[in-house]
């Protein structure tokens, strides 16, 4: 049974979508900036029709590894999922590996495609650059995601975001549109444009098929 709640905003994305939020947990963002990042994710979630039937969400914080807070198959009320997203911990680590989190997205989150009819999107919120030794397989993971029809949308935040990786992601597929922001302060301004873009990439649900009328048999 679908756990639904009334929409909180006029714009409300009711499409077939599996959306993964990937949050940079490096010290390139201060604790306060990470708070803005979390608020952005929660604000976005408020604008999605979250349920197992419509928009499924996952939330992952990444540093040198990946920490999943919400999985695509989690059957919880949207308000409860937003509450969990608001409690993502700030790691403030030296490194946030985009390669590791894309690998995690490829082999853990989208290992099995159980909703082929839905669009699959990874929103990669990145504010830092991983060391070169960690990025050896970066392109391989992006290509692997492309093979699984996972759209990767990088959102570069601030002066330390890895523009080279953002450009590589964009090159892989025309849908992989990047948003490059000078600071977390621009997230709120860009939110509606990002939500609209994601929503436009996802299919609408097909109309419900009605069972054929039973032929009446008279004896």
């Amino acid at each position: 049974e679908d756990i639904s709640e009334p929409p909180l905003h006029d714009f409300y994305c009711s499409r077939l979508l599996d959306l993964v939020f990937l949050l940079d947990g490096s010290s390139r963002l201060s604790e306060a900036e990470f708070e803005v990042l979390k608020a952005f994710v929660v604000d976005m979630m408020e604008r999605l029709r979250i349920s197992q039937k419509w928009v499924r969400v996952a939330v992952v914080e990444y540093h040198d590894g990946s920490h999943a807070y919400i999985g695509l198959k989690d059957r919880k009320r949207p308000s409860e999922l937003r509450r969990i997203a608001s409690q993502v911990k700030y790691a403030g680590s030296q490194v946030a590996s985009t390669s590791e989190v894309l690998k995690y997205t490829l082999f853990q989150i989208f290992s099995k495609i159980d909703r082929p009819e839905a669009s699959r999107i990874a929103l990669l919120l990145m504010a830092s650059q991983e060391p070169q030794r960690m990025s050896r397989n970066f392109v391989r993971y992006v290509q692997g995601l492309k093979k699984k029809k996972v759209i990767v949308i990088p959102v570069g935040i601030g002066p330390h975001a890895n523009l080279k990786q953002i450009r590589l992601i964009e090159k892989q597929a025309p849908e992989n549109k990047a948003f490059v922001l000078s600071s977390v302060d621009e997230l709120e301004q860009q939110r509606d444009e990002i939500v609209s873009y994601l929503c436009d990439l996802a299919p609408e649900a097909p109309p419900p098929t009605l069972p054929p009328h039973m032929a009446q048999v008279t004896v």
């Epitope: 201060s30 604790e31 306060a32 900036e33 708070e35 608020a39 929660v42 608001s86 700030y90």
Partner: nanobody, 124 residues
Framework: QVQLQDSGGGSVQAGASLRLSCAAS????????MAWFRQAPGKEREFVGF???????LYSSSVRGRFTISRDNAKNTVALQMMNLKPEDTAVYYC??????????????????WGQGTQVTVSS
């Protein structure tokens, strides 16, 4: 369990400065995120600013550039330095605390611990 005590309010002329203070007791202060909110007469309580456990800050657009939040983890205090005050800053100011990670910075319902409030009146 944290107890918060606000102080430093008063009546000033427009353009003046004022420093509010909030003393915390009964918890590991350094592990808390702190915020200031205010409530003007007949209006809802609104977010003013936030300070993380690492000292990083956020401000509402209405006070940015005029107000500064700081904290002293050794003394278990957080301060709100208010400069170039305007009549529209007149309100009761509250400090609030929450565990580092549990919530959204501007949402008052995410802060379980509150000071009693201190009145700031700015006249033109």
């Amino acid at each position: 369990q944290v107890q918060l005590q606000d102080s430093g309010g008063g009546s000033v002329q427009a353009g003046a400065s004022l420093r509010l203070s909030c003393a915390a007791s009964g918890g590991t202060f350094s592990s808390y995120a702190m915020a200031w909110f205010r409530q003007a007469p007949g209006k809802e309580r609104e977010f003013v600013g936030f300070i993380g456990s690492d000292g990083s800050t956020l401000y509402s657009s209405s006070v940015r550039g005029r107000f500064t939040i700081s904290r002293d983890n050794a003394k278990n205090t957080v301060a709100l330095q208010m400069m170039n005050l305007k009549p529209e800053d007149t309100a009761v100011y509250y400090c609030a605390a929450r565990a580092r990670y549990s919530g959204i910075y501007y949402r008052e319902t995410d802060y379980p611990y509150w000071g009693q409030g201190t009145q700031v009146t700015v006249s033109s």
